[in-house]
């Protein structure tokens, strides 16, 4: 028998520095977690102790903090090289800055192979990107070789900016021939490494003949066997075992997100490459693991540029940006409109001639807007200003909801109106009218939404049975502020870009902004 240790990360999302337990900015260092310096300590410890070790990343290193905003992926290549990753799969967020923003900082600079079997380049891009990412890699480990096949969410064109010269094929259809090639090469130990979410990971384990292990990402899935060490609630045991269609037991793993855990899976193979046993658990990278001094010093060196960046002007406002709780928790506020407009702008994807855009709606809990921005400072808006407005380090995500769920959400928005509570919704692409004289749960008297399947966008009444795409904070997608109906009833959830980054990009693009209060949210006569 031959034993392989798979160390894995996914959805690190720019958390190069240690973070608090909830993966936001580290405040009390003695209680902070993750970060590449701490990760390196643990990886090196395992490499020294065990003979056959692979360090893999399942995508979405890009996007999430000011590190990515400033360094645009160069930081990913640099620190992943320093940690000596063996391979990485492309995630959807790797395309956030377009194909060029992937090629130059990461594909050309990474010292490790970057994989995806289901992304096919065409046109002029084909020759430019040739060899910079691969469908599979044969990695020599000890006296054996291990095949790694990569995959990426086929939803990427709706979630990011891959452009028109990359085709995202069905994962299973694309993976099978590559696995067959590896088998032809007498590579009999094969890992599928990719970024399509836990449901697809399980399908790959079930359907792709010859895959021995699946290491996934995208859905931030936390798996654990035994008592979990932190706040995350396991979605199943680690590894999660799937019985394949040809009767094999295939371990599937994921390691939550944000570099908080290091996935640790030990696999025992027989001489024919069959999995005999698999066991392990994610390792919580808490403060009991010291940060590696040399990596930490490098982080501190790179940090300097971030501090300079946060005070630079992004753009100007010529109006007061009202982000006060007195406004945003009670009525339409222009800060809410600005943020929602930025959220929609960030999700412009012309992927179908029938649709002017794939999504037109935004909802945003007023309680998530934490500060106004005064225009009387020469109109200057900085990253620092935006960090005061959006201090939680969240993301603006894409969900699919039925109209009936949206209706419930808007009822929840005003179910206890008047108490300055955070659930009051700011909107974009939505016109809502409330009648507060009616009983809670029946206060939405009009709810019109902007069409997407139209050449001239207009507002139409919400249809209860129709499925709509909506951009919202991850906080709401996870049921925050009492929006349990969103969490329970959402049909799809894809995590998006860092909230501050979305707004800062929009302001930089617009240069001068002047958001108004324009009647998106109204109260019917006599009730307010």
């Amino acid at each position: 028998a031959w034993e392989l240790t798979i160390l894995h990360t996914n959805d690190v999302h720019s958390r190069l520095e240690q973070t608090s337990e909830d993966s936001s900015k580290c405040v009390n260092a003695s209680r902070c977690m993750g970060g590449v310096a701490r990760l390196f300590t643990k990886v090196q410890q395992i490499r020294r102790a065990e003979p056959n070790v692979l360090l893999l990343d399942a995508g979405d290193q890009y996007q999430g903090t000011i590190w990515f905003t400033v360094y645009k992926g160069a930081e990913v290549a640099h620190f992943m090289n320093a940690l000596r990753y063996d391979a990485m799969a492309l995630g959807n967020h790797e395309f956030d800055n377009g194909v060029e923003g992937l090629i130059e900082p990461l594909l050309k600079e990474a010292k490790f192979p970057i994989l995806s079997a289901n992304i096919k380049a065409k046109g002029p891009l084909a020759s430019q990107i040739s060899g910079l990412y691969l469908p599979y890699k044969v990695l020599p480990v000890g006296d054996e070789v291990v095949g790694i096949v990569g995959y990426t969410s086929k939803e990427t064109p709706f979630l990011s900016n891959p452009g028109t010269n990359l085709v995202f094929e069905d994962e299973i259809t694309a993976l099978q021939p590559e696995v067959d090639k590896l088998k032809t090469l007498n590579v009999n130990k094969i890992i599928a490494l990719g970024h399509s979410g836990f449901e697809m990971d399980k399908l790959i384990a079930q359907k792709v003949r010859g895959v021995d292990v699946v290491v996934g990402g995208h859905s931030n899935t936390f798996l654990y066997t035994g008592n979990p060490p932190s706040k995350e609630v396991p979605a199943g045991k680690y590894p999660f075992i799937v019985t394949s269609d040809d009767g094999r037991k295939v371990p599937v793993v994921q390691a939550y997100a944000f570099g908080k855990y290091l996935g640790y899976l030990k696999i025992e193979f027989d001489e024919r490459g069959n999995v005999i046993s698999s066991h392990g658990n994610p390792i919580l990278l808490n403060s009991s693991i010291p940060e590696d001094p040399s990596i930490k010093a490098d982080i501190n060196k790179w940090r300097i540029k971030l501090d300079n960046y946060s005070t630079q002007e992004l753009g100007k406002t010529i109006v007061y940006l009202d982000g006060s709780s007195q406004s945003c928790r009670f009525r339409e506020c222009n800060m809410g409109n600005l943020i929602c407009d930025a959220m929609i702008n960030n999700n412009l994807r012309h992927t179908d001639e029938m649709f002017w855009n794939h999504v037109s709606m935004c909802i945003l809990n007023g309680g998530g807007i934490r500060s106004p921005i005064d225009e009387r400072n020469n109109g200057t808006i900085t990253w620092e200003n935006l960090a005061a407005v959006l201090p939680f380090g969240g993301t603006f995500d894409l969900v699919q909801l039925k109209g009936s769920t949206l209706k419930k959400a808007f009822e929840h928005s005003v179910h206890r109106y008047g108490q300055s509570t955070g659930e009051f919704l700011q909107v974009g692409g939505i016109h809502v009218v409330y009648d507060l004289s009616r009983k809670p749960g029946d206060r939405v008297v009009k709810l019109d939404v902007l069409c997407t399947k139209c050449r001239v966008p207009s507002y139409d009444p919400l249809k209860m049975d129709e499925v709509y795409k909506v951009i919202l904070p991850n906080f709401l997608a996870n049921g925050g502020d009492g929006f349990q109906m969103i969490k329970d009833e959402l049909l799809r959830h894809d995590s998006g870009d860092q909230d501050i980054n979305v707004v800062s990009t929009y302001i930089s693009k617009m240069k001068v902004i002047y958001p108004a209060v324009e009647g998106r949210i109204k109260f019917s006569t006599g009730s307010h």
């Epitope: 063996d86 050309k108 600079e109 990474a110 010292k111 490790f112 192979p113 040739s130 060899g131 691969l134 469908p135 599979y136 890699k137 044969v138 990695l139 020599p140 480990v141 000890g142 090639k181 032809t184 090469l185 007498n186």
Partner: antibody
Framework: QVQLQQSGAEVKKPGASVKVSCKAS????????IYWVRQRPGQGLEWIGW????????KYNEKFKGRATLTADTSASTAYMELSSLTSEDTAVYYC????????????WGQGTLVTVSS | DIQLTQSPSFLSASVGDRVTITCKAS??????VAWYQQKPGQSPKLLIY???TRHTGVPDRFSGSGSGTEFTLTISSLQPEDFATYYC?????????FGQGTKVEIK
């Protein structure tokens, strides 16, 4: 563009060793295997082995095991092939090569290094 | 070791001719076969890999087929620059091996 530049011709005595270098450019050296192949005068091609500069693992043709040593210097993006206990049978052009997809054919070749073993 | 036997060893042909070279493996190699062209004093050049996939920049008059033990390289219309020696190679089992070569000469 991908280029593999090999060291110059060598004349060696029987029993000696030779070390041929192969400097890679135009791609990330650590991400691709380097293969070594030789061609004796007027003969066909013979695979010697490979090295993966990403972790320095090697694989040899049994025929050359113990005599051939493949190494790499990642800081210089250079691979080396050393052959010891030379005999006249080792007189050949030695090539380094790189693939597009692992193992699947040698897509890029060095210009070759002629090693002559003669007393 | 897997033996690869090419036939013919020598082939005389004219410009415009359709030329077929075969490569037989002593045991099955699925589709793990590559074809190379080599001109005197030059390094070999990859034409085909995975038995039938043309390498970037290789003219479409070159095609490969076969699987298991029998493989074919076809040049649909021989051009003056195609006169060279052609080798097949298997990369299914160690040690990787080459055929003895087929020299295509001008008639």
């Amino acid at each position: 563009q991908v280029q593999l530049q090999q060291s110059g011709a060598e004349v060696k005595k029987p029993g000696a060793s030779v070390k041929v270098s192969c400097k890679a450019s135009g791609y990330t050296f650590t991400r691709y295997y380097i293969y070594w192949v030789r061609q004796r005068p007027g003969q066909g091609l013979e695979w010697i082995g490979w090295i993966y500069p990403g972790n320095f693992n090697t694989k040899y043709n049994e025929k050359f095991k113990g005599r051939a040593t493949l190494t790499a210097d990642t800081s210089a993006s250079t691979a080396y092939m050393e052959l010891s206990s030379l005999t006249s049978e080792d007189t050949a052009v030695y090539y380094c090569a790189r693939d597009v997809y692992d193992y699947a054919g040698f897509a890029y070749w060095g210009q070759g290094t002629l090693v002559t073993v003669s007393s | 070791d897997i033996q690869l036997t090419q036939s013919p060893s020598f082939l005389s042909a004219s410009v415009g001719d359709r030329v077929t070279i075969t490569c037989k493996a002593s045991q099955g190699v699925a589709t793990a076969v590559a074809w190379y062209q080599q001109k005197p004093g030059q390094s070999p050049k990859l034409l085909i890999y995975w038995a039938s996939t043309r390498h970037t920049g290789v003219p479409d008059r070159f095609s490969g087929s076969g699987s298991g033990t029998e493989f074919t390289l076809t040049i649909s219309s021989l051009q003056p620059e195609d006169f060279a020696t052609y080798y097949c190679q298997q990369y299914s089992s160690y040690p990787w091996t080459f055929g003895q070569g087929t020299k295509v000469e001008i008639k």
